[in-house]
Interface confidence: low
């Protein structure tokens, strides 16, 4: 006997579905209706079979049932999803009280149609996307945004196929405080400039760019200045950073910036042109082979330097003598 594709825990909190069977029993998902957190994986299959069934579907007739769901967090993954199906799901979720939506390992085919005026989508606070490809390239964010109420606080996009957003088609994200573009190693500073559409992220406080192909702190500074964003905290850890190239223009960092993470950045010296004043600066786990001089560092309340060779004489010796 094949195992049930969906499993719900004893307290009806979390329900996980893995539809890996060639003829999956989709009705198994009905046991998830009581759950707060639902994870559905499609086994890499195409959901095109639902297109015909969905043609006449009207989520409004199920509005009361959808409103009564305990569902707060939903993950959908491992499938090829026609854009019309995605639109229908977002329409239906607009009647629910969903707060967090995660899409991962998806291929969205076709263009997401715009919603009708009277049907707002879900009032999400968090949207996460990982390894999602879109037929419409960088236009995907604008297409998705049309379906979301302006409540989004956290947007995390990893392993994206395109982050070059057509800025003219985007509305502002008035509540967005966290933008995480980590794990996009092909992004780079030029890509960051394209992704940070001016005046679209007025409330941004946290910007995470771990493993995002960043090259110099001053290049990131220039991208932030060009977009006019004012993050309080910036995470550039896990990038291979260079000290600013000679002749680079001086850049004025956002005045609000108080915390900068440059850990695991392969830095051999403290980069030039850091913000003059910070509350927190993390330079841990780099390749600094001498203690930074006070004039190299900004005025900082909380400085972390652990894990650099100069603090470990043995590691420094290995670095200087590669045969050791």
């Amino acid at each position: 006997a094949t195992p049930e594709p969906c499993q719900i825990d004893d307290e009806d909190v979390r329900c996980v579905c893995n539809f890996t069977h060639p003829q999956p029993d989709w009705s198994s998902a009905l046991q998830c209706v009581a759950a707060v957190e639902v994870e559905i994986r499609g086994g890499g299959r195409s959901l095109e079979e639902f297109l015909l069934k969905s043609a006449s579907a009207n989520p409004k007739q199920y509005a009361d049932m959808l409103k009564a769901l305990r569902l707060r967090r939903l993950t959908v993954g491992a499938a090829r999803v026609p854009a019309q199906i995605l639109a229908l799901v977002l329409h239906a979720l607009g009647f629910s009280r969903l707060k967090e939506l995660t899409l991962e390992d998806l291929e969205v085919t076709g263009q997401v149609p715009p919603p009708l005026q009277e049907t707002p989508g879900p009032a999400l606070t968090t949207l996460r996307l990982r390894n999602v490809s879109w037929a419409t390239g960088g236009a995907w964010l604008g297409e998705l945004q049309q379906w979301l109420q302006p409540s989004l606080k956290v947007l995390k996009v990893a392993q994206a196929s395109s982050l070059a957003f057509p800025c003219a088609q985007l509305r502002a994200f008035p509540a967005l405080t966290t933008l995480d573009l980590s794990d996009n190693p092909g992004l780079g500073e030029r890509g960051l400039t394209a992704a940070l559409c001016p005046r679209k992220f007025p409330a941004l406080e946290d910007l995470a760019l771990r493993n995002a192909g960043m090259e110099t702190p001053s290049g990131v500074c220039a991208a932030l200045a060009g977009a006019g964003v004012q993050p309080h905290r910036l995470d550039l850890s896990h990038n291979s950073l260079r000290a600013t190239a000679a002749g680079a223009r001086e850049c004025v960092w956002p005045a609000a910036l108080s915390s900068l993470n440059l850990s695991f950045a392969e830095l051999e010296q403290v980069p030039k042109g850091l913000p003059p004043k910070l509350t927190v600066l993390d330079l841990s786990c780099n390749k600094l082979n001498r203690a930074p001089r006070p004039e190299e560092l900004p005025a900082v309340d909380d400085l972390t330097l652990e894990g650099n060779p100069y603090m470990d004489p043995e590691a420094l010796q290995h670095q200087e003598d590669p045969m050791a």
Partner: antibody, heavy 121, light 106 residues
């Protein structure tokens, strides 16, 4: 840096109520669930419940649903826990702790220093 | 409720030793397990999350392993500052903690 500030101690009479506070700073208060944990030497650590400061959604441990009420004041970035009908068994250290932001629940990445509650006549 | 059992309440060790603290969940919790260290008069501090990922700033002598129902925290080359209480925690369904294991000197 992230800080969760709690008063060091509270002394209350049996049968009374108390409202413990936890002031958050150094991060966006409304982005992370705030949890409360009870610790007594004989019982170890017990999770009481959590609150989403964004919209005050709460989840409680069933053992505390008639004992604790969690609230927040977004304007001051402060979380509160009110404990009612206090008995000697409520004497403990109470910690507020921030839930790291992963989706299916998450570990607690920052903890307050704890408030020692003593119930005594 | 999911019960997290730390069968050893006390463990004796010496500086430089390798020690393993174990924790068993009463039902499947995937890798949704964290380990915390608590020293007298202090708050717990997260060491390991998602069963095997070291938290920021935690020395690499601390390693976590396991999935499903059986989990282990291993401290290699124990230092005197590692003498403390260690708690496991599951966060697969709400939150429950183990009863703790006190690491003390032989």
């Amino acid at each position: 840096q992230v800080r969760l500030q709690q008063p060091g101690a509270e002394l209350v009479r049996p049968g009374a109520s108390v409202k413990l506070s936890c002031k958050a700073s150094g991060y966006t208060f409304t982005t992370y669930w705030m949890n409360w944990v009870k610790q007594r030497p004989e019982d170890g650590l017990e999770w009481i419940g959590r609150i989403d400061p964004y919209d005050s959604e709460t989840h409680y441990n069933q053992n505390f649903k008639d004992k604790a009420i969690l609230t927040v004041d977004k304007s001051s970035s402060t979380a509160y826990m009110q404990l009612s009908s206090l008995t000697y068994e409520d004497s403990a250290v109470y910690y507020c702790t921030r839930k790291e932001g992963r989706q299916w629940g998450a570990y607690f990445d920052y903890w307050g220093q704890g408030t020692t509650l003593t119930v005594s006549s | 409720d999911i019960v997290m059992t730390q069968s050893q309440k006390f463990m004796s060790t010496s500086v430089g030793d390798r020690v393993s603290v174990t924790c068993k969940a009463s039902q499947y919790v995937g890798t949704n397990v964290a380990w915390y260290q608590q020293k007298p008069g202090q708050s717990p501090k997260a060491l390991i999350q998602s069963a095997s990922y070291r938290c920021s700033g935690v020395p690499d002598r601390f390693t976590g392993s396991g999935s499903g129902t059986d989990f282990t925290l291993t401290i290699s080359n124990v230092q005197s500052e590692d003498l403390a209480d260690y708690f496991c925690q599951q966060y697969n369904t709400y939150v429950t903690f183990g009863g703790g294991t006190k690491l003390e000197l032989k």
